[in-house]
């Protein structure tokens, strides 16, 4: 059951003018502008800033009152600021969308730590993984290694945005009191949407100051 | 990092033509609407012109509507923008601007110089 | 004539708070977006503020933007030498289907 509560002040379930709810697409997959309404008979209208009006034709654009505009199979001509009108007893109302691309490129992964790792048995281990991407892209960053079964390492994650090009995500990687059983390979991978990147750094533990 | 790079630009005689051109890199060209600007010396900033994204609309000012045309060529990462009859007050300096929260990027500029 | 309007002039000492307004109409700036453009002497334009209020990342929060109605305004608070330029509004006009921007407004750093 979806139940309709009409208010002809507000046409628009969630209104966004005063900045436009930012929405991630990817070309080839489906696209929602959720300007669902508050009665079924309001007329809406999509428009793509600023000339461009877009016509659902019942196959690749579809109206649905409870949801939106569904957009079957988004291309590049939907990037950009969509706006959503509807006018009710003479006055215009618009909520607006800004769809964004949402990358999956992974453009650089390292750990910053010399290789091979050489460590004394004790002393704690500090492995940073740094992966970079284009602005709008999230990745998932894991780390695999030796004693992982015991859950040895704690991994504080953290990300960078203040470049106005790139992103730049951190995973960091410790494990106090170091001991034999943890030598070995260490790999951190990361992964954003399909796209996959990984790296790799042999850990060695030494008894004595003899390195 | 966002590049536009315009070039075209010169001296020629009132009547004339030339076309300006706007190379870009650093970002996904098809992704965003563009717009020329131009700057008379001294003066303000002047709207011109817009395509969008997969260039299937244009507008243009009235100052230079039916004298000037917008075109992008996708393939090649490139804006265009042809201009005929010109007049010593088309006489500029014309930005190519990538269009998204605003007019985000702007190219260095490309002077137009129309004297007899 | 510029179809928004700003003053042409404004200045402040350094440290100082400036306002500089644009005032438009209904198939504007009251229908759609403002933004701000800085242009130094001698550069092209850069994007200050868009969606009335919203900075880009590397803008000092020094610059503020804001809209009410038909007008907006662009607030510099602690005033720097640096900030000595010209000052840009526009704003889509649905009317016309054009891009109208602000005659400018020269702010000098007393």
């Known amino acids: 059951i979806y139940i309709f509560i009409s208010d002809t002040g507000r046409p628009f379930v969630e209104m966004y003018s005063e900045i436009p709810e930012i929405i991630h697409m990817t070309e080839g997959r489906e696209l929602v502008i959720p300007c669902r309404v508050t009665s079924p008979n309001i007329t809406v209208t999509l428009k793509k800033f600023p000339l461009d009006t877009l016509i659902p034709d019942g196959k690749r654009i579809i109206w649905d009152s409870r949801k939106g505009f569904i957009i079957s199979n988004a291309t590049y001509k939907e990037i950009g600021l969509l706006t959503c009108e509807a006018t009710v007893n003479g006055h215009l109302y618009k909520t607006n969308y800004l769809t964004h691309r949402q990358t999956n490129t992974i453009i650089d992964v390292q750990i910053s730590t010399p290789r091979p790792v050489k460590l004394l048995r004790g002393h704690t281990l500090v492995l940073n993984c740094t992966a970079t991407t284009p602005l709008n892209t999230r990745v998932q960053m894991t780390w695999s290694y030796p004693d992982e079964k015991n859950k040895r390492a704690s991994v504080r994650r953290r990300i960078d945005q203040s470049n106005s090009h790139a992103n730049i995500f951190y995973s960091v990687l410790t494990i106090d009191k170091m001991q034999n059983k943890d030598k070995g390979l260490y790999t951190c991978r990361v992964r954003s949407g399909p796209s996959f990147k990984s790296v790799n750094t042999s850990v060695h533990i030494y008894d004595k100051a003899f390195i | 990092e966002v590049q536009l790079l315009e070039s075209g630009g010169g001296l020629v005689q009132p009547g004339g033509s030339l076309r300006l051109s706007c190379e870009a890199s650093?970002?996904?060209?098809?992704?965003?609407?563009m717009n020329w600007v131009r700057q008379a010396p001294g003066k303000g900033l002047e709207w011109v012109s817009i395509?969008?994204?997969?260039?299937?609309?244009?507008a243009y000012s009235d100052s230079v509507k039916g004298r000037f045309t917008i075109s992008r060529d996708n393939s090649k990462n490139s804006l265009y923008l042809q201009m005929n009859s010109l007049r010593a007050e088309d006489t500029a300096i014309y930005y190519c601007?990538?269009?998204?929260?605003?007019?985000?990027?702007w190219g260095q500029g490309t002077t137009v110089t129309v004297s007899s | 004539q510029s179809v928004l309007t700003q003053p042409p002039s404004a200045s402040g000492t350094p440290g100082q708070r400036v306002t500089i307004s644009c005032s438009g109409g209904?198939?504007?700036?009251?229908?759609?977006?403002v933004s701000w453009y800085q242009q130094l002497p001698g550069t092209a334009p850069k994007l200050l503020i868009y969606?009335?209020?919203q900075r880009p990342s590397g803008v000092p929060d020094r610059f503020s933007g804001s809209k009410s109605g038909t007008s907006a305004s662009l607030a510099i608070s602690g005033l720097q030498s640096e900030d000595e330029a010209d000052y840009y509004c526009?704003?889509?006009?649905?009317?016309?289907?054009?891009?109208?921007f602000g005659g400018g407004t020269k702010l000098t750093v007393l």
């Open positions: 601007v990538k269009v998204y929260y605003g007019m985000d990027d």
């Open positions: 650093g970002f996904i060209f098809r992704d965003y609407n």
């Open positions: 395509i969008t994204n997969d260039g299937s609309s244009t």
């Open positions: 209904s198939s504007n700036i009251g229908s759609n977006y």
């Open positions: 969606f009335n209020f």
């Open positions: 526009a704003a889509w006009d649905d009317r016309v289907n054009v891009w109208v």
